[in-house]
Interface confidence: low
């Protein structure tokens, strides 16, 4: 037998309960049977209702939930914080990256800068968005400043008695690009450069957004019914008994909280798997894996290609010269 | 090795930024994340306890409740006895995981996929195609791995550029004006600009 | 004011391995490289290779691939390099210098370091 | 690699002349030439890099000259704390390489 309420009238019960719920009309005067109670079965006179045991259920299951996401708390500011700062900081490459290549130009290629700018301008806004998910191919991205490039080398460097650039020959230019392989393997070294540490770092942001989501998803978790009479039974069925200042047995809140959260717990072997392969995934970022190493110098390898098409400007001209004559004629007339 | 452009910024703009005791890199960074991340690594097994620990129980109490009665702390009774008579908790755990679960799971199970397909072979940094396009050995090193380049110059350096300082100070307030390399400035530990060395006649 | 602080003379059995240190003070360690010169007795300066501090990478003139092995220890500022297999032709003066910036030239220099391999 | 040849081997000056040393590379460097001193028993030190710039803290008394292959470093009205051994190297990729050395000491 439990020792008897100390409180004959019920009067403590109902103090703690106005905290929860105010309006007293819930809470026995004195204690009663209590036979239509669910949760707290008594094992005699009790001080709760069916209606005190509905309001405990649900502050049980609202309790979990504010346990569970102060749990969380921690970790989701870890992972929201990192994402944003890395999401940033990867824009910031980005950014430097352009400045340093529209630098080599200006420095280096003066007669190019108007043109090369909106170039580099187009190629890193491209890069930025597909860091952020977009669908764009790095190989076409690559490809795509190579071939505004070159025609741009051609008649301002290369050939710059031709008047000013048509259509005709750009588009001849264009395709001589690739058929000449006038850049040498530049361009392929920075397709696989661009693309691997492109690759890697959109799915380094992917995985700490998603890791945003899944904790997101587990603080708003709802506790089953089931789960809920458990709570109440652990923390607030003794109230009923008139016991206040007794707290639950450890193993007990242990068995009880395995059984809450017997799903969540099923999440524990993946989440394992995830933070290991991030943790894999970013000790293979660096040299070619690491966007930051590759993309500020990347300006350093452009310019070594316009200077490979330097050295080789000579046949280059001469080449290009029967290859796309009949555009040049076009233009001259 | 890799060659900068000779001016920093248009009108010589001098990028100063305040020194920073220990300076980041996104690869310390990163690397910073992976072990506070791996402090977690036990999150959801150790959800249970935490909660408990979190929560009011019984630790110095000699009686405690066990969701029945009041008994003793360490008797067998403080754990088992509140679960009689009422519903199945084995039951509760053989229904299988709650739907938001799966949805957690299956995302997990996605992007794990996805790390795993990415992460890069130990050892393996460059690709045998890159080794193919006539990168000479002996030039980078043991490995390859430092060679991010070549043609009949030479092969090309790369330096990691940026240096990822605090609350990311370091920033350029020039975006489309072409930039320059940073040095240290040895003097007063401000990065300032400097002429690069190595420049075309 | 910028230091590169080198191990002392250092005496070695041929065949045998011996790892030269570089303690440098006064700069950002991790934002310049570390380059090592070889100069033997009334002789020129040979570049053996250069270690990129922050990432630990090195980069070798072909000439000392498999002789030497260029590392370096961020939490002290220190650079070192091993030298195995070592014959008299390793017996020179070692020095340590600090990259002025994006290219191989060498602003500051260690003291240098004698070794010498004897039998 | 690049070759780079210095000459005179040896020079002897008096305090107060004006000295030319020449550095031939191989092939062409452009502009990415260095100059060091060194003196007995020490390390060398920077003088001139980018073929014309003068390092920090150097007397404008040196000054460097060239570009393509040819470069000469000229010192006028030579100190007592210039005699030593010159080198020049090349900066324009890997691996640098250094000069033979010119020995320069007091006449």
């Known amino acids: 037998q439990p020792p008897p309420p100390p409180d004959a009238t019920c009067h403590q019960v109902r103090s703690f309960f106005q905290r929860l719920q105010p309006g007293l009309k819930w809470v026995p005067e004195t204690p009663v049977p209590g036979s239509d109670l669910q949760v707290c079965l008594p094992k005699g006179p009790t001080c709760c209702s069916r209606k005190m045991e509905e309001k405990y259920q649900l502050t049980a299951r609202l309790n979990m939930e504010q346990l569970l996401q102060s749990a969380s708390m921690e970790l989701k500011f870890l992972i929201i914080q990192n994402a944003a700062v890395f999401q940033e900081a990867f824009e910031i490459v980005v950014r430097h990256a352009k400045n340093y290549t529209n630098a080599m130009f200006k420095n280096n290629y003066p007669s190019l800068t108007p043109q090369a700018f909106e170039f580099v301008g187009e190629f890193f806004t491209d890069v930025s968005l597909y860091i952020l998910g977009s669908d764009i191919n790095v190989d076409d991205m690559v490809n795509e400043l190579f071939d505004s490039l070159f025609p741009v080398i051609y008649t301002q460097m290369m050939n710059p008695g031709l008047p000013e650039s048509v259509l005709d020959i750009n588009e001849c230019l264009r395709g001589a690009r690739r058929d000449l392989k006038v850049f040498g393997s530049f361009p392929k070294l920075i397709m696989t450069q661009v693309s691997k540490s492109l690759q890697v770092t959109r799915i380094f942001l992917q995985a700490l957004n998603l890791g945003i989501e899944v904790i997101n998803t587990t603080d708003h978790l709802k506790f089953s019914k089931d789960c809920g009479r458990m709570l109440t039974r652990m923390w607030y069925c003794s109230y009923c008994q008139g016991l206040m200042m007794v707290k639950p047995c450890g193993g007990y809140c242990n068995v009880v909280m395995q059984g809450c959260m017997a799903g969540v717990v099923e999440i524990d072997k993946y989440w394992r798997e995830y933070i290991l392969s991030l943790e894999e995934l970013v000790n293979g970022m660096y040299r070619i894996y690491d966007m930051e190493n590759v993309l500020l110098g990347l300006f350093s390898t452009i310019h070594d290609s316009i200077q490979y098409v330097q050295k080789n400007g000579g046949k280059l001209t001469t080449t290009i010269g029967k290859l796309c004559a009949h555009s040049q004629q076009r233009q001259y007339r | 090795s890799a060659y900068y452009p000779e001016d920093l910024f248009i009108d010589k703009k001098i990028l100063k930024v305040a020194h920073v005791e220990h300076e980041e890199t996104l690869s310390s960074r990163r690397r910073e994340l992976i072990q506070k991340l791996k402090s977690f690594i036990n999150f959801y097994s150790a959800l249970p306890g935490y909660i408990c620990s979190h929560s009011p129980v019984a630790e110095n109490d000699t009686l405690c409740w066990n969701g029945q009665e009041l008994v003793e702390r360490y008797s067998q009774k403080a754990a088992r006895n509140g679960m009689k008579n009422q519903f199945n908790l084995h039951e509760l755990k053989m229904k299988g995981p709650e739907p938001v679960v799966s949805q957690i799971i299956d995302k997990l199970k996605h992007i794990n996929q996805l790390l795993r397909t990415m992460s890069v072979p130990k050892g393996k940094v460059l690709d045998k195609s890159l080794d193919e396009e006539g990168l000479e050995s002996g030039d980078c090193g043991d490995d390859e791995d430092e060679c991010i380049g070549s043609s009949g110059d030479g092969m090309v350096k790369v330096k990691n550029q940026l240096r990822f300082l605090a609350e990311l100070a370091y920033d350029l307030d020039v975006d489309d004006a072409p930039g320059n390399k940073q040095h240290g400035n040895q003097k007063d530990n401000e990065i300032t600009t400097s002429h690069s060395v190595g420049n075309m006649p | 004011q910028v230091q590169l602080q080198q191990s002392g003379t250092d005496l070695a059995r041929p065949g045998a391995s011996v790892k030269l240190s570089c303690k440098a003070s006064g700069y950002t360690f991790t934002s310049f490289g570390i380059s090592w010169v070889k100069q033997r007795t009334g002789q020129g300066l040979e570049w053996i290779g250069e270690i990129y501090p922050r990432s630990g990478s090195p980069y070798y003139n072909e000439k000392f691939t498999g002789k030497a092995t260029l590392t370096a220890d961020k939490s002290s500022s220190t650079a070192y390099m091993e030298l195995r297999s070592l014959t008299s032709e390793d017996s020179a003066v070692y020095f340590c210098?600090?990259?002025?910036?994006?290219?191989?030239?060498?602003?500051?220099w260690g003291q240098g370091t004698a070794l010498t391999v004897s039998s | 690699d690049i070759q780079m040849t210095q000459s005179p081997a040896s020079l002897s000056a008096s305090v107060g002349e004006t000295v030319t040393i020449t550095c031939r590379a191989s092939e062409n460097i452009y502009s990415y030439l260095t100059w060091y001193q060194q003196k007995q028993g020490k390390s060398p030190q920077l003088l001139v890099y980018?073929?014309?710039t003068l390092a920090e803290g150097v007397p404008s008394r040196f000054s460097g000259s060239g570009s393509g292959t040819q470069f000469s470093l000229k010192i006028n009205s030579l100190q007592p704390e210039d005699f030593g051994t010159y080198y020049c190297q090349h900066h324009y990729g890997t691996p640098p390489t250094f000069g033979t050395g010119t020995k320069l000491d007091l006449k």
């Open positions: 980018n073929a014309k």
């Open positions: 210098a600090k990259d002025f910036g994006s290219s191989y030239v060498f602003d500051y």
